[in-house]
Amino acid sequence: EVEKTACPSGKKAREIDESLIFYKKWELEACVDAALLATQMDRVNAIPFTYEQLDVLKHKLDELYPQGYPESVIQHLGYLFLKMSPEDIRKWNVTSLETLKALLEVNKGHEMSPQVATLIDRFVKGRGQLDKDTLDTLTAFYPGYLCSLSPEELSSVPPSSIWAVRPQDLDTCDPRQLDVLYPKARLAFQNMNGSEYFVKIQSFLGGAPTEDLKALSQQNVSMDLATFMKLRTDAVLPLTVAEVQKLLGPHVEGLKAEERHRPVRDWILRQRQDDLDTLGLGLQGGIPNGYLVLDLSMQEALS
């Protein structure tokens, strides 16, 4: 807190410029008009103030805008954005994507801070949904952003925004998140042809149901093992040996290396050993020949 003192004669700032770095903190407080500062915030970003001097400037803005800064000031906060508390940011109404980008640039290269998380939350809530341009921007700065959202939050992502998603953006998503994103991706890419469709949908397949995997097996997609291992176990279990063989194509040989891991392990336990043997991979653990498999869930449904 800087003591209130009168501005010395001839020191009243007429504009925000480099000469202000020679002002002591009390002089900045006394001689810089807050309204002038607000209208020339863009200039602050070109002047090498110390952190202490910036604290004084922030204090002046806080006094001028106790209810929260207007967007014209927010857009030019630069480093001062990192001095804001989440409580400060909750008072803001940020509607411009340019403002969002400018503030994310300041934090670039660092983890998502509480300030950034609050800013994004305010921005997205203000827009009502995660539109494509916003998602594009956020995933460019924070590739893991999408997977930091809850399934409920992801439900507000329109299918058109899915075009902005890159495979690496989904690296840390869990199955519940992919369950929400997969139907949106399916809708977004529905007009693409077979091979192009598979390239786009591949990253989302951790949310695909059995019937969609069966359909893909008829399209010679040659799914790699890494993708197969991320599929939902409950979606893989009903697939036949022939369907898995078609789904994986030449990659089917990789099943041997993964036979002790889910979902391959659980899938093997559901297949007839005879059928597994047709793959010639030496997969063991299938249902022995001569055993009858009763699907009790089907029986209950009939009764």
Epitope: E18, V44, N45, A46, I47, P48, F49, T50, Y51, L54, H76, L77, G78, Y79, L80, F81, A102, E105, V106, K108
Partner: nanobody
Framework: LQLVESGGGLVQPGGSLRLSCAAS????????IGWFRQAPGKEREGVSS????????NYADSVKGRFTVSRDNAKHTVCLQMNSLKPEDTAVYYC??????????MGQGTSVTVS
């Protein structure tokens, strides 16, 4: 973002020193740089500044005509040449920088003693 100052030391009145400011982990080329100093028991004060292009320089009245700030783009540093040093120039000297989008950096300081 971190800046690193060097070149400080002990010098007699009337002597000269050349301080350097370099960046750690990034390049200073598009940063405007300010030099500041803090004497024991006193508030930090501005000494000089130079724009990112090097085309604009400013000095505090107390050092005008004695100190010169410049950019050495080959070495990616900003230098403060201090001539005709006086005992009252004794302080810890810091550089602070501002780059694109208002990104900021500051150093830990280098000590100058004129005695």
């Amino acid at each position: 973002l971190q800046l690193v100052e060097s070149g400080g030391g002990l010098v007699q009145p009337g002597g000269s020193l050349r301080l350097s400011c370099a960046a750690s982990g990034f390049t200073l080329d598009n940063y405007a740089i300010g030099w500041f100093r803090q004497a024991p028991g006193k508030e930090r004060e501005g000494v000089s500044s130079i724009s990112s292009s090097g085309g604009s320089t400013n000095y505090a009245d107390s050092v005008k005509g004695r100190f010169t700030v410049s950019r050495d783009n080959a070495k990616h540093t900003v230098c403060l040449q201090m001539n005709s040093l006086k005992p009252e120039d004794t302080a810890v000297y810091y550089c602070a920088g501002v780059g694109d989008y208002g990104r900021r950096a500051m150093g830990q300081g280098t000590s100058v003693t004129v005695s």
